[in-house]
């Protein structure tokens, strides 16, 4: 994970608190899930590597009418508030596999927890 702070520069990275807040929101979503999350909507899976936050946003934004993940979408926007320039991290739009939103959230949560435990905030 080379640039948590978006794509403007590889400079400052999000403080651990911001990462923790995002983790807590994802935990809330998974714990409060009763019916299929977002009616079982499918989203593109992403590479959990550089540019992960913006990639996650670009994938989840395609889910409409699902209030359960709107806060997550807005929090992900905190990491990359301005659009990625064409050509930057082209992997953002590599689209080969679709998974359910619920699985996407679980995968993202597991990865973020791992990063948090390892202190990998940059």
């Amino acid at each position: 994970l080379t640039c948590l702070g978006g794509f403007a520069s590889p400079g400052p990275v999000p403080p651990s608190t911001a990462l923790r807040e995002l983790i807590e929101e994802l935990v809330n979503i998974t714990q409060n899930q009763k019916a299929p999350l977002c009616n079982g909507s499918m989203v593109w899976s992403i590479n959990l590597t550089a540019g992960m936050y913006c990639a996650a946003l670009e994938s989840l934004i395609n889910v409409s009418g699902c209030s359960a993940i709107e806060k997550t979408q807005r929090m992900l926007s905190g990491f990359c508030p301005h659009k990625v320039s064409a050509g930057q991290f082209s992997s953002l739009h590599v689209r080969d596999t679709k998974i359910e939103v619920a699985q996407f959230v679980k995968d993202l949560l597991l990865h973020l927890k791992k990063l948090f435990r390892e202190g990998q905030f940059n």
Epitope: G11, S77, K83
Partner: antibody
Framework: EVKLVESGGGLVKPGGSLKLSCAAS????????MSWVRQTPEKRLEWVAS???????YYPDSVKGRFTISRDNARNILYLQMSSLRSEDTAMYYC????????????WGQGTTVTVSS | DIVLTQSPASLAVSLGQRATISCKAS??????????MHWYQQKPGQSPKLLIY???NLESGIPARFSGSGSRTDFTLTINPVEADDVATYYC?????????FGGGTKLEIK
């Protein structure tokens, strides 16, 4: 309730400097990007600067190199350091919570007035 | 820079009638099928307030009388029916390309 309170505006001579502050409350400040947007005397709105939750900054060419946006996540304060001020920088400056390019400027403060005049 | 042209500059509408405001962009503001166009309301003496994001999504707490439509370069904000409290200036804003830009505003008055 989300609250954004700007301060630091005033009258400054061309070429001078000024530092604006914005105290945020009612949301997890550290988790959101923030921006400054100004409104000219002619009521035109102009985006001035943005900062991500991680501290990456974004500026239009009109202020790049003259203005610096920063944040103090411990105190929930957003700043705008303005230097080499010009008459065209005269405006009402608003602090806004930026929910990203997909959601726009979700919350705005009441603004602080900056007048650049000799 | 993307130029946003709003029309009309001002309009007067009777209470209970429909108000339609147009915003035209000098180039497309769509990103992978999502229109990065937002609408704000600014009442006299107040700061702007987000009404609509991504062309047609109603921000939380905004009455359903407000609606947005459009894609690529042509966008519309509709208020139906208009109420006295809607007297304000309305602005469109694009976030598809830096620098982010706003339209010149449309002032809504009651006839």
């Amino acid at each position: 309730e989300v609250k954004l309170v700007e301060s630091g505006g005033g009258l400054v001579k061309p070429g001078g400097s000024l530092k604006l502050s914005c105290a945020a409350s009612g949301f997890t400040f550290i988790s959101y990007a923030m921006s400054w947007v100004r409104q000219t005397p002619e009521k035109r709105l102009e985006w001035v600067a943005s900062i991500s939750s991680g501290g990456n900054t974004y500026y239009p060419d009109s202020v790049k190199g003259r203005f610096t946006i920063s944040r103090d996540n411990a105190r929930n304060i957003l700043y705008l350091q303005m230097s080499s001020l010009r008459s065209e920088d005269t405006a009402m400056y608003y602090c806004a919570r930026l929910d990203g390019y997909y959601f726009g400027f979700a919350y705005w403060g009441q603004g602080t007035t900056v007048t650049v005049s000799s | 820079d993307i130029v946003l042209t709003q029309s009309p500059a001002s309009l007067a509408v009777s209470l209970g009638q429909r108000a339609t405001i147009s915003c035209k962009a000098s180039e497309s503001v769509d990103n992978y099928g999502k229109s990065l166009m937002h609408w704000y309301q600014q009442k006299p003496g107040q700061s702007p307030k987000l009404l609509i994001y991504r062309a047609s999504n109603l921000e939380s707490g905004i009455p359903a009388r407000f609606s947005g439509s459009g894609s690529r370069t042509d966008f519309t904000l509709t208020i139906n029916p208009v109420e006295a409290d809607d007297v304000a200036t309305y602005y469109c804003q694009q976030s598809n390309e830096d620098p982010w830009t706003f339209g010149g505003g449309t002032k809504l008055e009651i006839k």
